[in-house]
């Protein structure tokens, strides 16, 4: 906190310029008009102030705008954005994507800070949904952004925004998140032909139900093992050996290396050993010949 002192004669700032770096903190406080600072914030971003001097400038803006900064100031905060607390940011109303980009640029290369998380939250809530342009911007700066959202938050993503999602954006998503995103992706890509559709939908398949996997198995998609291992176990279990063979195509040989891992392990336990033997991979652990398999879930449904 800088104590209030009168501005020395001849030092009153007429504009925000380089000469201000020669002002002491108390002189900045006394000689720079807050309203002038607010209208010339863009100039602050070209002047090599010290961090201490920037603290004084922030203090002046805080006094001028106790209810929160207007967007005209926010857009030009530059480094000062990093000095804001989440509480400061919650007072803002940021509606312009350009403002969002400008502030994300300041934090570029760093982890998502509490300030950035609060800013994004305010921005998305202000827009009402996570539209394509916003999602494009956010995933460009933070590839893991989408997977940081709760399933409830993801439900506000319109299917049209799914076109902006890259495979790496989904790397850290868990099954609950993919359960929400998969139906949106299916809707977004529904007009694409078989092979193009599979390329686009592939990263979302961790949320796919059994019937969709069965349908894909009829389309010669040659799913790789990495994708197969990310499928929901409950979606894989009902697939027949023939369906898995068609789904994986030439990659079916990879099942041997994964036979002790989910979902392959659990799937093997559900298959007849006879059927597994047809693959010629030496997969073991299937239901021995002559055993009767009772589907208890079906029995419960009937009773």
């Amino acid at each position: 906190e800088v104590e209030k002192t009168a501005c020395p004669s001849g030092k009153k700032a007429r504009e925000i310029d380089e000469s201000l770096i020669f002002y002491k903190k108390w002189e900045l406080e006394a000689c720079v008009d807050a309203a002038l600072l607010a209208t010339q914030m863009d100039r602050v971003n070209a002047i090599p102030f010290t961090y201490e001097q920037l603290d004084v400038l922030k203090h002046k803006l805080d006094e001028l705008y106790p209810q929160g900064y207007p967007e005209s100031v926010i857009q030009h905060l530059g480094y000062l954005f990093l000095k804001m607390s989440p509480e400061d940011i919650r007072k803002w109303n940021v509606t312009s994507l350009e403002t969002l980009k400008a502030l994300l640029e300041v934090n570029k290369g760093h982890e998502m800070s509490p300030q950035v998380a609060t800013l994004i939250d305010r921005f998305v809530k202000g827009r009402g949904q996570l539209d394509k342009d916003t999602l494009d911007t956010l995933t460009a700066f933070y590839p893991g952004y989408l997977c940081s959202l709760s399933p409830e938050e993801l439900s506000s993503v319109p299917p049209s925004s799914i076109w902006a999602v890259r495979p790496q954006d989904l790397d850290t998503c868990d099954p609950r998140q993919l359960d929400v995103l998969y139906p949106k992706a299916r809707l977004a890509f529904q007009n694409m032909n078989g092979s193009e559709y599979f390329v686009k939908i592939q990263s979302f398949l961790g949320g796919a139900p059994t019937e969709d996997l069965k349908a894909l198995s009829q389309q010669n998609v040659s799913m790789d093992l990495a994708t197969f291992m990310k499928l929901r176990t409950d979606a894989v279990l009902p697939l027949t050996v023939a369906e898995v063979q068609k789904l994986l195509g030439p990659h079916v040989e990879g099942l041997k290396a994964e036979e002790r891992h989910r979902p392959v392990r659990d799937w093997i336990l559900r298959q007849r050993q006879d059927d597994l033997d047809t693959l010629g991979l030496g997969l073991q652990g299937g239901i021995p010949n002559g055993y009767l398999v009772l589907d208890l879930s079906m029995q419960e449904a009937l009773s």
Epitope: N45, F49, G78, L80
Partner: nanobody
């Protein structure tokens, strides 16, 4: 973002020193740079500044005519040439930078003693 100052030392009154400011982990070329100093027990004060192109320079009244700020973007370095040094120039000298989107950087300082 970190800046690194060097070139400080002990010098007699009337002597000269040249301080350098370089970037660690990024390039200085599009950064405007300011030199500031802090004498023991005193507040930091601005000494000089130079624009990113090098076309514009500014000096505090106390160093005008004695100090010259320059930059060599090929070497990604900014210099502060200090001539006719006085005991009152004794301080830790820091460089502070501002780049695109208002990104900021500052160094740890280099000590200058005139005695």
């Amino acid at each position: 973002l970190q800046l690194v100052e060097s070139g400080g030392g002990l010098v007699q009154p009337g002597g000269s020193l040249r301080l350098s400011c370089a970037a660690s982990g990024f390039t200085l070329d599009n950064y405007a740079i300011g030199w500031v100093r802090q004498a023991p027990g005193k507040e930091r004060e601005g000494v000089s500044s130079i624009s990113s192109s090098g076309g514009s320079t500014n000096y505090a009244d106390s160093v005008k005519g004695r100090f010259t700020v320059s930059r060599d973007n090929a070497k990604h370095t900014v210099y502060l040439q200090m001539n006719s040094l006085k005991p009152e120039d004794t301080a830790v000298y820091y460089c502070a930078g501002v780049g695109d989107y208002g990104r900021r950087a500052m160094g740890q300082g280099t000590s200058v003693t005139v005695s």
